[in-house]
Amino acid sequence: LQIQCYQCEEFQLNNDCSSPEFIVNCTVNVQDMCQKEVMEQSAGIMYRKSCASSAACLIASAGYQSFCSPGKLNSVCISCCNTPLCNGPRPKKRGSS
């Protein structure tokens, strides 16, 4: 089965690479996950995304869990997911009406 992910291998400043031009087809039977790396810097939030094998992504996210402190300067969070384009934009919260 082939999965599609958003991919920007180099960090993008304040651009979460979630527009159509960043969509790629991952390698069949090898890259079965989408990965997202979010780094918080003084200049803003940096995003890096790619396809990944489940082993590689899980090794990375587990090994670097201690570096993830959302909202804190120099925090780096790595997440893995396995549905199409799941490393895209976070769904916007609906305002209560």
Partner: antibody
């Protein structure tokens, strides 16, 4: 035990070609980036390029772009550096190293290096 | 490309001395900096990753600090086996540039 072993170095004439191998054991290369780094005699470390073996995605230093090609054979757990149009300034010890493909990760295991000499 | 500039390029010190090597990035690299030790004829060895984390098996006399653009490697009490060349390297984006190296020699 994690190990990287380079081979294929030697003496080659300017304009010639050489293929270096980096055989990995103790880990699966598909879970890591494999980097090539070189060191000219008496000089510092210079990054050459890298491959993410699971996708085949490669990046190269400007100094070797268009002349060097990095590839990997995941069934052999081995990465390669194909060097074409070699120049005298490519003379160096070539190392392969592994790096988890996340920002904060570093090159934690290195091979012993293989010497490439480009001379007529 | 982001440049990494090390200083000094060489230094002379005695066993027991405290040694400090600095590395400056030309742009913010957060904490994505590593330090390596290399002895003549040998491959580099990882000492510090992510600016301040001691790699497994590395003696605690080595420490790293810094974030953004300024980074420091400190050897609290220099030992005979520490005479070597030290390199900083940024792991943030491609290319993962190395500093030019600092040679630590015996005084």
């Amino acid at each position: 035990e994690v190990q990287l072993v380079e081979s294929g170095g030697g003496l080659v004439q300017p304009g010639g070609s050489l293929r270096l191998s980096c055989a990995a054991s103790g880990f699966t290369i598909t879970n890591y980036g494999i980097h090539w780094v070189r060191q000219a005699p008496g000089k510092g470390l210079e990054w050459v390029g890298r491959i993410y073996p699971d996708s085949g995605a490669t990046y190269y230093a400007d100094s070797v772009k268009g002349r060097f090609t990095i590839s990997a054979d995941t069934s052999k757990n081995t990465a390669y550096l194909q060097m074409n149009s070699l120049r005298a300034e490519d003379t160096a010890v070539y190392y392969c190293a592994r790096k988890l493909w996340v920002t904060l990760a570093s090159m934690d295991y290195w091979g012993q290096g293989t010497l490439v000499t480009v001379s007529s | 490309d982001i440049q990494m500039t090390q200083s000094p390029s060489s230094l002379s010190a005695s066993v027991g001395d405290r040694v400090t090597i600095t590395c400056r990035a030309s742009q913010d690299v957060s904490t994505a900096v590593a330090w390596y030790q290399q002895k003549p004829g040998k491959a580099p060895k990882l000492l510090i990753y992510s600016a301040s984390f001691l790699y497994s098996g590395v003696p605690s006399r080595f420490s790293g600090s810094g974030s953004g653009t300024d980074f420091t490697l400190t050897i609290s009490s220099l030992q005979p086996e520490d005479f070597a060349t030290y390199y900083c390297q940024k792991s943030y984006n491609t290319p993962p540039t190395f500093g030019q190296g600092t040679k630590v020699e015996i005084k």
